[in-house]
């Protein structure tokens, strides 16, 4: 579930609002797990995609819009 469109195919359950306790670094999560919406502080974390929270790791991850790649969906996919 890496670079995909904004679709609800990777729903998980809420991890909560960790507020300042959230880790600020991440890469795109490639393994299955429980996801939730990212806390509000990560509202603009994903440049061209949707942010979701990896519950087990308490870290944000991005689901990129079509045509974008990168940990924060910040790069255009030249092969798209």
């Amino acid at each position: 579930d890496g670079n995909s469109t904004r679709s609800p195919e990777t729903n998980g359950l809420l991890c909560g609002d960790p507020e300042e306790n959230c880790a600020a670094t991440t890469t795109q999560s490639k393994r299955k797990g429980h996801f939730s919406r990212c806390p509000k502080q990560y509202k603009h974390y994903c440049i061209k995609g949707r942010c979701r929270f990896v519950v087990a790791e308490q870290t944000p991850s991005c689901v990129c819009d079509e045509g974008y790649i990168g940990a924060r969906c910040e790069r255009v996919d030249l092969f798209y």
Epitope: P8, T10, G12, L13, L14, R37, P39
Partner: antibody, heavy 119, light 106 residues
């Protein structure tokens, strides 16, 4: 259109059991997190339990160990198995769809089913 | 556990502006959503993510959220706006609802 329809409510004695069902239609049920929310007569809304599409579950403290949320994606149905029922569980039970992942908001609600726990 | 506090009731004159508050510790750091519920009916989402409006909800409904208070504002109140209103947020693997506010349109 997008719709949720609850069933299974009724009168049950304290200590008894009941299973609620929520039939979903008009959307890809398996892709959404779902919740149960209840409302005691004349009272406010209270979230009961939630279930992610990968099977992760969570419950409000007052029902832990007594209620079990589950789903059958092949039948587009959400369930709530309620055991050891108490008078304070009396309420209208709504199933609700969470927009995208859990942690968003409830954008679709069912009409509710009434559960009455009384001797 | 996290708590959201709403006034039990709010009254507004027909055509005037009603404001319903929802208080919680650092609520401005959370997403807040608002639901309208009329007697005998299921709740309906009227504001999500603090201030966004679902399709079909009149522009008269708006929301804001900062500090310790979120506010639902209903401008040019109509008789059909009379209902119970609930705020909702998320905290530590659970959903939290406010106690609800009964809006009366005079």
């Amino acid at each position: 259109q997008v719709q949720l329809l609850e069933s299974g409510g009724g009168l049950v004695q304290p200590g008894g059991s009941l299973r609620l069902s929520c039939a979903a239609s008009g959307f890809t049920f398996s892709s959404y997190a779902m919740s149960w929310v209840r409302q005691a007569p004349g009272k406010g809304l209270e979230w009961v339990s939630g279930l992610g599409h990968v099977g992760y579950t969570t419950y409000t403290d007052s029902v832990k160990g007594r209620f079990t949320i589950s789903r059958d994606n092949s039948k587009n149905t959400l369930y709530l198995q309620m055991n050891s029922l108490r008078a304070e569980d009396t309420a209208v039970y709504y199933c609700a769809r969470d927009y995208l992942d859990f942690g968003y908001y409830f954008d679709v609600w069912g009409q509710g089913t009434l559960v009455t726990v009384s001797s | 556990s996290y708590e959201l506090t709403q006034p039990l009731s709010v009254s507004v004159a027909l055509g005037q502006t009603a404001r319903i508050t929802c208080s919680g510790d650092k609520i401005g750091k959370k997403y807040v959503h608002w639901y309208q519920q009329k007697p005998g009916q299921a709740p309906v989402l009227v504001i999500y993510d603090d201030s966004d409006r679902p399709s079909g909800i009149p522009e008269r409904f708006s929301g804001s959220n900062s500090g310790n208070t979120a506010t639902l504002t209903i401008s040019r109140a109509q008789a059909g706006d009379e209902a119970d209103y609930y705020c909702q947020a998320w905290d530590m693997q659970s959903v939290v609802f406010g106690g609800g506010t009964k809006l009366t349109v005079l």
